[in-house]
Every structure is written in structure tokens, then in C-alpha cells.
Amino acid sequence: YDFTNCDFEKIKAAYLSTISKDLITYMSGTKSTEFNNTVSCSNRPHCLTEIQSLTFNPTAGCASLAKEMFAMKTKAALAIWCPGYSETQINATQAMKKRRKRKVTTNKCLEQVSQLQGLWRRFNRPLLKQQ
């Protein structure tokens, strides 16, 4: 999906009002310095591409993020503010529902959510020069 046509300010508002809090809740008990940010993004469409990938694509050691509250709210925000986004998600979501397993918060998932927090922070500051 090409995130170029999303309404970035409205997605930012959704992040600030609720998604950010859910990410913090997920990470509660974890030190903010515990993980190094290794994933970066250069502009808002790129940030959303990376956010979608980390949130919804299962990775080795962390297959369970897509059903977390922050993930479902992210999905809702993208469906509302990115024209045509929801149509691209239908097959993926149906496949995901079939293989839903017991929720386990692994260290790998915590690291991944830490990366997500960094991507969202970068998304919210699009005018900053890339480090």
C-alpha cells in the first residue's frame, strides 16, 4: 500500500490521543534505554510503511502484535485516514484470524514495540533531519 495520500495530521492526532498510550502500557515495566532503535524512516509515508510492517507482519520471535490494542487502533486509523487502505487488508486479516494463538509477550515483542515507538516519534516530527 502507498501511504502517500494519507491524512498525516489526523493519523498523528489518533496516535497522540490513544495509540501512544497503548504502546506505553504494552511497554510498562521496561526501561526506555533497554533497546536500541535500529529501524528508522525518512518521511511520513515511509514511517507508516515501516509501522505497518512492524505492527502487522509476524517476525521471528514475535508473532502476536497484530491483536494488541495499539495494533487494532493503528489499523482503524489507517482505514479511516488512508483512502483505499482497508481493501488491501481484508485477506491478510482473515488469514491472521485463523492462526490466532495464545498471547505471549516475549522480549523480542518488547523490542519490536520499542522500535514502533521510535517510528511513531519520527512520524510526528517530519521536519527533523534524519540522524
Epitope: T18, I80, I90, T93
Partner: antibody, heavy 113, light 108 residues
Framework: QVQLVQSGAEVKKPGSSVKVSCKAS????????ISWVRQAPGQGLEWMGG????NYAQKFQGRVTITADESTSTAYMELSSLRSEDTAVYYC??????????WGQGTLVTVSS | EIVLTQSPGTLSLSPGERATLSCRAS???????LAWYQQKPGQAPRLLIY???SRATGIPDRFSGSGSGTDFTLTISSLEPEDFAVYYC?????????FGQGTKVEIK
């Protein structure tokens, strides 16, 4: 085909609360993408609020709470401190591409002493 | 807060005639964030037009939307018996996402 099924009609006393549910089925769906709209008898549509982003119409601030349970694909709208003017049909509707694409059948809430 | 004002309040027309409904916003609304709905008595509203001019799935092409800025129009090119209903515009530009007060299209 997305379907939104709402809970049944309610009769409430002034000062009490009501909680209306909206269960979704079919399609790719997040119950966080639900907004609530009400319609008083013979009146127009009035947007109440939604979760993404988390905001409510000013007139309902402090009285309305909108929540969702993804595990059951259900959204909820709770309205407290009910008064007779809250007598209305309450609709849930799924937001998509900045419009309310799918609607529930409506739940009539009557506030009467 | 963006206020939407619809006019006329009631439109009395015959089947086959053209209906032109207006929705005026108190502030600029991005065309992406203007929608039109139809509501018949005892039924939930139904989305007709989103993004000011895009027809929702299954909506006949006699319905069309146009406009930008603060002035938007819903046109029904040739009224069918089932088109007599109340029509609402709604903005998604800024919260609260208000509706207009509605235009009733009735049979003359």
C-alpha cells in the same frame, strides 16, 4: 458483507445510565473504527463521538464513554446522567475513508420517569 | 466547530425531475471529508457519496456530488420513487464531525 448488530431497546429512568452494544461481523474490521450517532424523534442526525481519534462532541463530554472489545468485535457506548432529552435512536456506524459506511439498525433509548 | 447548513429544508418535486441539494459549511472543508447520506423513515442512514463526489458501492449513477471549499451539492438527475427521503451532509474535516440539519425530498 459487514453487518453491525445493536442491542435491543431500553427504557431508563432520568439520572441513570445506558450502555448500548454494537457487534460486528463480516469483512476486515476493527471495532475501534466505530462512531456513534443519535437521532431524537423527528430530528436530524447528531454525531456523538468515536475512538479514533478519541474524541466526543462537546455536549456529551463527561457523560459519554465509547469503548471496544476486539476479542468479540463489539463496540459500546455508555451515556450517563440520562435526561428526557436523551430519548433517541442511537446508531453505531463503521468509519472508513472518512465516512460512515456501515450502520447498525439503531437502538431506541427512552428516558422516562 | 464547523457548522453545516443545508438548503432548502424541504424540496417538493415529482418523479423524473432533477433535485439539487445544497450544503454550506461555516469553514473550508477538504473535499476528502464531505459525505452525503440518505435516510428513509424507520431506517438507518445509508452512505451515498464520500469525498464530496465519489459514489459509495451500489449507489446508482443518478446520484452525484460536487463542490469544494464551503459549498457542496448533491444532485439526483432524475428522481425515482424510492429517492424520496431525507438527505444529510456530514464533514470529517474537524471534530465534532457534524451533520447538516437535513433536506427532505418529498413528492409534489
Amino acid at each position: 458483507q459487514v453487518q453491525l448488530v445493536q442491542s435491543g431497546a431500553e427504557v431508563k429512568k432520568p439520572g441513570s445510565s445506558v450502555k448500548v452494544s454494537c457487534k460486528a461481523s463480516g469483512g476486515s474490521f476493527s471495532s475501534y473504527a466505530i462512531s456513534w450517532v443519535r437521532q431524537a424523534p423527528g430530528q436530524g442526525l447528531e454525531w456523538m463521538g468515536g475512538i479514533i481519534p478519541m474524541n466526543y462532541a462537546q455536549k456529551f463530554q463527561g457523560r459519554v464513554t465509547i469503548t471496544a472489545d476486539e476479542s468479540t468485535s463489539t463496540a459500546y457506548m455508555e451515556l450517563s446522567s440520562l435526561r428526557s432529552e436523551d430519548t433517541a435512536v442511537y446508531y453505531c456506524a463503521r468509519q472508513l475513508a472518512a465516512a460512515l459506511v456501515y450502520w447498525g439498525q439503531g437502538t431506541l433509548v427512552t428516558v422516562s420517569s | 466547530e464547523i457548522v453545516l447548513t443545508q438548503s432548502p429544508g424541504t424540496l417538493s418535486l415529482s418523479p423524473g425531475e432533477r433535485a439539487t441539494l445544497s450544503c454550506r459549511a461555516s469553514q473550508n472543508v477538504n473535499t476528502r471529508y464531505l459525505a452525503w447520506y440518505q435516510q428513509k423513515p424507520g431506517q438507518a442512514p445509508r452512505l451515498l457519496i464520500y469525498a464530496a463526489s465519489s459514489r459509495a458501492t451500489g449507489i446508482p449513477d443518478r446520484f452525484s456530488g460536487s463542490g469544494s471549499g464551503t459549498d457542496f451539492t448533491l444532485t439526483i438527475s432524475s428522481l425515482e420513487p424510492e429517492d424520496f427521503a431525507v438527505y444529510y451532509c456530514q464533514q470529517y474535516e474537524s471534530s465534532p464531525y457534524n451533520f447538516g440539519q437535513g433536506t427532505k425530498v418529498e413528492i409534489k
